[in-house]
């Protein structure tokens, strides 16, 4: 509309008692330069006088009359574009409508701006993303609809009352579109942050508390589990029983399914929080864990290494190398599955016990023909003695001896 003056400024400005207000403002008059400017508080039009009545906070006229409020209120504008204002300090009773009465040579205009001054510093507002998931970086935003050049403030982030270590980025806006102070914090929440209180605290330049906003974190996370085993050391003997219990220490949202895994493979028909293993065999040794799922995904407990102890199995002998040439070296190795590992070995040559040989390996540095024959062994651990296996044959090759001519 060409019959109107054009103004741009925030619709409402917010402040509190004792602070200040900075009003960014631009205008375009219909014709010529500004000749007179009056700032009213709660102006009312008087039809009888065809003038505005109200408290005059600021006056700039040709005759140079200046109201007493002039020291507190400053017009920082000019005659054709800028109508920026500052009130410092601002008082509770400044709340209401500010009226900018502008007059050029031939035209007049009253522009209204709302001012909301509270008794105490009002709280900032924390903005969270719609969903927070563990270990996924999010940006927490703290917004305060206030900024003023004459009144420095700071926004500080606290987690459970303790300042957060992450670096926050604070920005201010003092434009005709918006006036605010904003602090943004990048944060990778862990599952343990679920339910914790985050605070954005408004402080003055000296760090004195002015106001705050708090939110409770809702961190979506996979179930967090604890596995307990009886016996606690997870060492049993064949035929014993074992009980494993899975406890959910935290889940958000609630868990839906439970399963057990052995060596990474799911155990069939084991879908409760207790795993009972009766009369265990050595094949049941391995790494066990429980897996509980929710809408976020599956959570796994730490692994429990179940050791099923048993006496040594029948031994086998490995010979390095047979056949062997007389004078060469040979090594025998006694192999037997056992838990715990065998502590003692008994060696046999052609069925006769080799005295003093109790190690897993037997080394012959210089083979002679008489070493030839069958070697077998027996392994022993704390649970018993194994059986002698079939043994291995050592063949010793040697040159002719005692050559006789016929």
């Amino acid at each position: 509309d060409s019959s109107k003056w054009v103004f741009e400024h925030p619709e409402t400005l917010y402040a509190w008692e004792g602070a200040c207000v900075w009003i960014p403002c631009t205008y375009r008059a219909l014709d010529g330069d500004l000749e007179s400017f009056i700032l009213f508080h709660n102006p009312e039009y008087n039809k009888n006088t065809s003038k505005f009545d109200g408290t005059r906070l600021y006056e700039s006229t040709k005759d140079g009359k200046v109201p007493s409020e002039q020291k507190r209120v400053q017009f920082l504008g000019d005659k054709n574009k800028n109508c920026t204002l500052s009130i410092h300090p601002v008082h509770l009773n400044d709340s209401g409508q500010l009226g900018l009465r502008m007059e050029s040579k031939t035209e007049k205009w009253m522009e209204r701006i709302h001012l909301n001054v509270s008794e105490r510093p009002f709280p900032p507002h924390i903005q969270l993303p719609p969903e927070i998931q563990e270990s996924q970086e999010v940006t927490l935003t703290c917004l305060l609809n206030f900024s003023c050049y004459g009144y420095p403030i700071q926004l500080q982030w606290l987690l459970e009352g303790v300042p957060m270590r992450q670096a926050a980025v604070t920005s201010t806006s003092l434009t005709i579109k918006s006036v605010f102070t904003r602090s943004e914090l990048k944060f990778s929440p862990q599952w343990s942050h679920h339910g914790k209180i985050v605070t954005c605290q408004l402080q003055d330049a000296d760090g004195k508390f002015l106001s705050n906003d708090t939110v409770q974190l809702n961190v979506k996370h996979t179930p967090k589990l604890e596995i307990k085993v009886t016996p606690s050391d997870a060492i049993v003997r064949e035929g014993d029983s074992v009980t494993m219990t899975c406890e959910v220490s935290s889940s958000n949202p609630e868990y839906t399914t439970v399963s057990w895994l052995k060596d990474g493979t799911s155990l069939k028909k084991q879908n409760t929080f207790t795993l009972n293993l009766r009369e265990v065999t050595k094949d049941q040794s391995g790494k066990y864990c429980c897996q509980v799922s929710n809408d976020v995904g599956p959570g796994r407990s730490e692994e429990v290494f179940l050791q099923v102890q048993y006496a040594p199995e029948p031994s086998t002998v490995q010979i390095l190398h047979s056949p062997a040439v007389e004078g060469s070296q040979v090594e025998f190795l006694c192999m037997s599955l056992a838990n715990p590992l065998p502590t003692n070995y008994t060696w046999y040559h052609n069925g006769k016990e080799m005295q003093g040989r109790t190690e897993e390996k037997v080394h012959i540095p210089k083979i002679l023909p008489w070493h030839a024959g069958t070697y077998s062994c027996v392994a022993e651990n704390i649970l018993g003695t194994g059986q002698r296996g079939p043994g291995a044959e050592l063949d010793v090759q040697y040159p002719p001896k005692k050559v006789t001519t016929v």
Partner: nanobody, 122 residues
Framework: QVQLVESGGGLVQAGGSLRLSCAAS????????MGWFRQAPGQERRFVAG????????VYADSVKGRFTLSRDNAKNTVHLQMNSLKPEDTAVYYC???????????????WGQGTQVTVSS
């Protein structure tokens, strides 16, 4: 081709000491094991101690443990049986024998020395 020669036997008073030696020559030396046996009149040969040439420590019969010490001298192909705190029941003919391993039965030894007499008087 294997010869075993014992030495060091004799008469000694109870509580005294003797050192028996066995020198090996031929194919039995340097690889395999040497054993000492004893045979009292009217009794069978019994294992006393044994040791391998290449490695491992000596093996003793329970009756001599703590009193007898068996050692080897690979350079001279000789084994020594140091006998301390001798008792009258140690009286016997002492034989050294060779086998691929230390066995407790005399049947498993292939070569034998001629024996040396040890007499312990009370």
């Amino acid at each position: 081709q294997v010869q075993l020669v014992e030495s060091g036997g004799g008469l000694v008073q109870a509580g005294g000491s003797l050192r028996l030696s066995c020198a090996a020559s031929g194919r039995a030396s340097g690889s395999g094991a040497m054993g000492w046996f004893r045979q009292a009149p009217g009794q069978e040969r019994r294992f006393v101690a044994g040791i391998e040439w290449s490695s491992g420590g000596p093996v003793y019969a329970d009756s001599v443990k703590g009193r007898f010490t068996l050692s080897r001298d690979n350079a001279k192909n000789t084994v020594h049986l140091q006998m301390n705190s001798l008792k009258p029941e140690d009286t016997a003919v002492y034989y050294c024998a060779a086998a691929p391993w230390v066995f407790s039965s005399p049947d498993d030894y292939m070569y034998w020395g001629q024996g040396t007499q040890v007499t312990v008087s009370s």
